[in-house]
């Protein structure tokens, strides 16, 4: 099998993550996303920072970005709703909800993912799955097929060490280990799934990938349940 990585991961089983979305700008993969309701995809707010003059669409049911697949469908975006407190220069509140032009056609390869509503930290050491079409190695290669990796959750105190993220990790964020295995450029907006439930969204802040002293940062969806519910209502 191909040895492509998210970073240090492997190619995902085709269509085994039916919630996975590719947020696209002018027909090219920009960020990951996760289908959270029939007509809504959750991603990262920073993903649309440079998209002002471009066409944003959402690809669902895909494994390969380029090859034809029966389940693949590209949806236009009716409405983009970034979190009102998201700002270009911080990683806080880095969430974006995209309303599709119509309800997604659901099936084995397209299905919303339940998301965590109980605002409690995931236990450190819990293995969580992150997937995406972000770069797969230190050369910067972008894969055609979906990649994934299992990462252990890192406790906030360690993540906030001066040598790590130096206090930047609020209670609304969580970290996962990044020693060679990690999310990276192009994975932003994608899902961190623990026990079959969406717990985090890959933040789109600029960060060195694969360095154990710079753990991956993920926005905790449970901390934003009220906002998500209000937008989806």
């Amino acid at each position: 099998p191909p040895r492509g990585r998210i970073l240090g991961g492997r190619e995902a089983e085709a269509h085994a993550r039916p919630y996975m979305a590719s947020v696209q700008l002018n027909g090219a993969h920009l960020c990951g996303g996760v289908l959270v309701a029939e007509q809504w995809v959750l991603s990262a707010a920073h993903c649309l920072e440079d998209a002002a003059d471009g066409k944003v669409q959402v690809l669902l049911g895909a494994h390969s970005l380029s090859q034809p697949e029966p389940s693949k469908r590209l949806y236009d975006v009716l409405r983009a709703v970034p979190h009102p407190d998201s700002q270009p220069d911080t990683i806080d509140h880095d969430l974006l909800l995209l309303q599709l032009s119509e309800k997604a056609t659901l099936g084995p390869a397209v299905r919303p993912l339940p998301w965590q509503r109980v605002d409690r930290d995931v236990a450190p050491g819990t293995l969580c799955d992150v997937a995406g079409w972000g770069i797969v190695n230190h050369a910067g290669r972008r894969p055609d097929s979906l990649q994934h990796v299992l990462l252990p959750v890192l406790d906030r105190a360690t993540c906030n060490r001066r040598t790590h993220h130096d206090g930047a990790i609020t209670e609304r964020l969580m970290c996962a280990e990044s020693n060679r295995r990690d999310s990276c450029k192009g994975d932003s907006g994608g899902p961190l799934v623990c026990g079959g439930v969406l717990e985090g969204v890959v933040t789109s802040g600029s960060r060195v990938c694969g360095n154990r002293k710079k753990p991956g940062i993920y926005t905790r969806v449970a901390s934003y349940a009220a906002w998500i519910d209000s937008v989806l209502a």
Epitope: P2, R3, G4, I135, V136, N137, H138, A139, G140, R141, R142, K185, G186, S206, R207, V208
Partner: antibody, heavy 113, light 106 residues
Framework: EVQLQQSGAELVKPGASVKLSCTAS????????MHWVKERPDQGLEWIGR????????KYDPKFQGKATITADTSSNTAYLQLSSLTSEDTAVYYC??????WGQGTSVTVSS | QIILTQSPAIMSASPGEKVTMTCSAS?????MYWYQQKPGSSPRLLIY???NLASGVPVRFSGSGSGASYSLTISRMEAEDAATYYC?????????FGGGTKLEIK
């Protein structure tokens, strides 16, 4: 179509500096990494370093630390390689490459008094 | 740093002949890239992640290997394959190239 257009050949004096450019078309440089590679006659290829244009993060082969400085300007979709305190050892062809997948045509640098 | 040793340094092959060249790492690496370079031209990516063919590369090229030993094979040599071939590892920083194998046509 992805293309990398490098600046023209340079003839520079020992001790001087030179800044080479690499302008991309067909993709945004900030979406991946931009690398610079050195080729000397009969000496093969040497990886100099890379930049993540989205945030300016750079990584160099220790051998080129202090000699090479890689920068990028996302507004012009251009990556740069600056070489300082030039000696005859720096006479070479320098290539830029996007994710090591697409390569520029190379820029010849000759250091001579 | 990891040193990559390519062998042979120079080789020649007749059209239609099978060609295999190797790249040995001074310590184990997780994958290998291979490039082709013709005189006066830029390098071209042939193989990424040990065995995956880059876009537009003919299927007569293949890569294999693991640990500290990797190889590039051309199933049937063609005149246009005369070039210098380089391996490169992306496992351990700094990311190093091999010294190259020059392939000539007989």
């Amino acid at each position: 179509e992805v293309q990398l257009q490098q600046s023209g050949a340079e003839l520079v004096k020992p001790g001087a500096s030179v800044k080479l450019s690499c302008t991309a078309s067909g993709f945004k440089i900030k979406d991946t990494y931009m690398h610079w590679v050195k080729e000397r006659p009969d000496q093969g290829l040497e990886w100099i370093g890379r930049i993540d244009p989205a945030n300016g993060n750079t990584k160099y082969d220790p051998k080129f630390q202090g000699k090479a400085t890689i920068t990028a300007d996302t507004s012009s979709n251009t990556a740069y390689l600056q070489l300082s305190s030039l000696t005859s050892e720096d006479t070479a062809v320098y290539y830029c490459a996007n994710a090591m997948d697409y390569w520029g045509q190379g820029t010849s640098v000759t250091v001579s008094s | 740093q990891i040193i990559l040793t390519q062998s042979p340094a120079i080789m020649s092959a007749s059209p239609g002949e099978k060609v295999t060249m190797t790249c040995s790492a001074s310590s184990s690496v997780s994958n290998m890239y291979w490039y082709q370079q013709k005189p006066g031209s830029s390098p071209r990516l042939l193989i990424y992640d040990t065995s995956n063919l880059a876009s537009g590369v003919p299927v007569r090229f293949s890569g294999s290997g693991s640990g500290a030993s990797y190889s590039l094979t051309i199933s049937r040599m063609e005149a246009e394959d005369a070039a210098t071939y380089y391996c490169q590892q992306w496992s351990s920083y700094p990311w190093t190239f091999g010294g190259g194998t020059k392939l000539e046509i007989k």
